[in-house]
């Protein structure tokens, strides 16, 4: 029950996180005009990953897309790439985790398969969250670096006169959305990985029959080799040599703390 809850919660948290990453990537307010020294301004500038916008005091806003690839800063391209990779990984992770959910039955899918899928989706969520956090952090670092190196915004005034406005940019709302969303996706991924440990069966239970030897009765236990390698259930030093013949089902197996991760 706890495993199902952990897995379900991990899925929901990751879903919210990925929705947030998508929202942050699409938002225009990655950097906003710093109004600290000039709180009353005729225009308010803000920029996103895909376009830059100007809002007038009337409320009228005009946005312009960055219709170039080669002319854009390499850092901006890197941030775009990180966010897109984060979204893609997160989306695949969500798809995988839907099928991995313990509460959803798909044919005769074994718990081991669900455990593997849960682990896969968990890792994908972790990487997705890290990509988003990295992308937002790179952009934030870029803003901090350029804060004092004011950006010149060109506006053509009336009669062909050119007016240059010195503008400094600070953190926009999208950065905070991205950080929180990345964190949520990361937490969701960790929860999925934790749930995977509880989902993974200790070993496959075969209906094996033990055979009597002429001398000492030796019960053949499938997975005996695994026990000797340290990955099976013999980590608790259970006897695998028994006097009487019995089926494997009669041999009580205890859950091990050494499950698949």
């Amino acid at each position: 029950m706890a495993v199902t809850a952990c897995q379900g919660l991990g899925f929901v948290v990751s879903l919210i996180g990925i929705a947030g990453i998508i929202a942050a990537t699409c938002m225009d307010q990655w950097s906003t005009q710093d109004l600290y020294n000039n709180p009353v301004t005729a225009v308010f500038n803000y920029q996103g990953l895909w376009r830059s916008c100007v809002r007038e005091s009337s409320g009228f806003t005009e946005c312009r897309g960055y219709f170039t690839l080669l002319g854009l800063p390499a850092m901006l391209q890197a941030v775009r790439a990180l966010m897109i990779v984060g979204i893609v990984l997160g989306a695949i992770g969500l798809l995988v985790s839907i099928f991995a959910l313990k509460c959803i039955r798909i044919g005769s899918m074994e718990d081991s398969a669900k455990a593997n899928m849960t682990l896969t989706s968990g890792i994908m969520f972790i990487v997705s969250g890290l990509c988003a956090i990295a992308g937002v952090s790179v952009f934030a670092n870029m803003l901090v670096t350029n804060f004092w190196m004011s950006t010149a915004n060109m506006y053509t005034g009336m009669g062909g006169m050119v007016q240059t406005v010195q503008t400094r940019y600070t953190f926009g709302a999208a950065l905070f959305v991205g950080w929180v969303a990345g964190g949520l996706t990361l937490i969701g991924g960790v929860m999925m990985c934790i749930a995977c440990r509880g989902l993974a069966p200790e070993e496959t239970n075969y209906k094996a029959v033990s055979y009597h030897a002429s001398g000492h009765s030796v019960a053949y236990k499938p997975g005996g080799f695994k026990a000797s390698t340290g990955f099976g259930s013999n980590t608790k030093n259970k006897k695998i040599y028994d006097g009487g013949a019995r089926t494997e089902d009669e041999v009580q197996s205890y859950p091990s703390k050494h499950d698949y991760v």
């Epitope: 005729a42 225009v43 053509t156």
Partner: nanobody, 118 residues
């Protein structure tokens, strides 16, 4: 140089309607209307992007005014309904070559007076 020709202003009673027209001598990126009430500053009323038809209206006129365009005539129209006394102003047609922002408006009309009074 683009010439803007405005028409349609006049005296109207409160609650009445007027239709302002503005024709440009050649195509522009954006066209719109600004107004200046007596003793007040210039206020953006509405604008339309000629290429895709996207429109913007000031909150004070939303639901009462509509802006439309006719690309074949390089013209823009402002339909004003339910006019109020506070709508009294000189209405200026404006056009931008590459932007609709006030600072980037390249061309201005002479203005047409709209008076709302009983």
């Amino acid at each position: 140089e683009v010439q803007l020709l405005e028409s349609g202003g006049g005296l109207v009673q409160p609650g009445g309607s007027l239709r302002l027209s503005c024709a440009a001598s050649r195509s522009t990126y954006c066209m719109g209307w600004f107004r200046q009430a007596p003793g007040k500053g210039l206020e953006r009323v509405a604008n339309v992007y000629m290429r895709n038809g996207d429109t913007w209206l000031a909150d004070s006129v939303k639901g009462r005014f509509t802006i439309s365009r006719d690309n074949s005539k390089n013209a823009v129209y402002l339909q004003m309904n339910s006019l109020r006394a506070e709508d009294t102003a000189v209405y200026y047609c404006a056009a931008g070559r590459s932007s609709c922002l006030e600072a980037s408006i390249s061309y201005w009309g002479q203005g047409t007076l709209v008076t709302v009074s009983s």
